[in-house]
Amino acid sequence: MAVTACQGLGFVVSLIGIAGIIAATCMDQWSTQDLYNNPVTAVFNYQGLWRSCVRESSGFTECRGYFTLLGLPAMLQAVRALMIVGIVLGAIGLLVSIFALKCIRIGSMEDSAKANMTLTSGIMFIVSGLCAIAGVSVFANMLVTNFWMSTANMYTGMGGMVQTVQTRYTFGAALFVGWVAGGLTLIGGVMMCIACRGLAPEETNYKAVSYHASGHSVAYKPGGFKASTGFGSNTKNKKIYDGGARTEDEVQSYPSKHDYV
């Protein structure tokens, strides 16, 4: 039960995380105009990975796409790449994890196959989350660097009379969405990996040794425990009351392939 819950929760958390990564990637507010030195501006600037926007206090907003690839900063291209890789890996991970879910029956898929798929999707989620966190962090670092550079030459004057205020940019909402979403995807991936351990059948089954008692023929079966989900019959650690000695292989019962949660 715990394994199924962990797997299901991991899937849901990852799903929310990837939705957040997609939302963050599409958002225009990666960087927003810093209003500290000009809180009364009638024009507000903000920028995303794909376009920059200007919102006038009159309510009109104008957005312009970055219609060039070569003219964009390498860092911005890198952030775009990281976010897209994160989304692609996350999407593939979601697809794989749907088939890996223990509560979903697909043909005669073995638990070992489901365990492998769960692990694969978990790793994909972890990498996806790391890509998103890395992308957002690189962009944030770029903002911090540019912020202090523009602070250094904040005012350029003509004879000290005319002021030209340079626009500074600070963290936008998309950065926080990206960090949280990346974190959730990462957590979801870890949960999937944990769930995988519970799903994987252990192959180290020990042969049972039979002891013949003088009275009744009772075979005591030691060890040979498998990780069990608690579903289906499990006779591996029961006493076998019969007349002869038997190895465990003869009575081994695997959990049913057709269990539902």
Partner: antibody
């Protein structure tokens, strides 16, 4: 077509208050900021403040030290500007004006002359 | 507050001549986000409210004759009437549309010589 019709001229005593109305027609009143601008005789135009009828959000010119209150009645498509503690320097023509792209005033009311005299 | 300074205070031109009005702001009105200058020009005839002529320093409002043109960037702006007509007699104001409070220039009166 867009029209902004203001209330009639007023004569007030110093210390009193005046409330000028501006009825809008020909456009979606709730979707555009409404501004108030005044022009004292021989003086430059002076922006007083603005209101967004959609949610009642307001911005004011601090030079009026809280004497200006701008309100609206969306059902009547009307904006109001109240100026309190009137002084003789407040004698001016008061205009309402719609805020448009480029943060400019594209349509203006005909103006309301407010005379402050003892 | 941004201070808007217009020059000259008044201007007398002959019909058909060019008229040039200058406006200087105490702070740059250029927005880096869209490379637009937030400066507006208005025309006010006697007994009438102001009328919008040009916004974004150089964009003519609909219905404004093309003899009116705006230019300039940053802190220095110009309104040019290429061929003055009798109906252009008015006071012309520039306005800062970049920072609150929105401020106006002192006005330039255009008359016919």
């Amino acid at each position: 077509q867009v029209q902004l019709v203001q209330s009639g001229a007023e004569v007030k005593k110093p210390g009193a208050s005046v409330k000028v109305s501006c009825k809008a027609s020909g456009y979606a009143f709730s979707n555009y900021w409404m501004n108030w601008v005044r022009q004292a005789p021989g003086q430059r135009l002076e922006w007083m403040g603005q209101i967004y009828p959609g949610n009642g959000d307001t911005k004011y010119n601090g030079n009026f030290k809280g004497r200006v209150t701008i309100t609206r009645d969306t059902s009547a498509s009307t904006a109001y500007m109240e100026l309190s503690s009137l002084r003789s320097e407040d004698t001016a023509v008061y205009y309402c004006a719609r805020y448009y792209r480029g943060n400019c005033f594209d349509y203006w009311g005909q103006g309301t002359l407010v005379t402050v005299s003892s | 507050d941004i201070v808007m300074t217009q020059s000259p205070d008044s201007l007398a031109v002959s019909l058909g001549e060019r008229a040039t009005i200058n406006c200087k702001s105490s702070q740059s009105l250029l927005n880096s986000g869209n490379q637009k200058n937030y400066l507006t020009w208005y025309q006010q005839k006697p007994g009438q409210p102001p009328k919008l002529l040009i916004y974004w320093a150089s964009t003519r409002d609909s219905g404004v004759p093309d003899r009116f043109s705006g230019s300039g960037s940053g802190t220095d702006f110009t309104l040019t009437i290429s061929s003055v007509q009798a109906e252009d007699v008015a006071v012309y104001y520039c306005q800062n549309a970049y920072t609150y409070p929105l401020t106006f220039g002192g006005g330039t009166k255009v008359e016919i010589k």
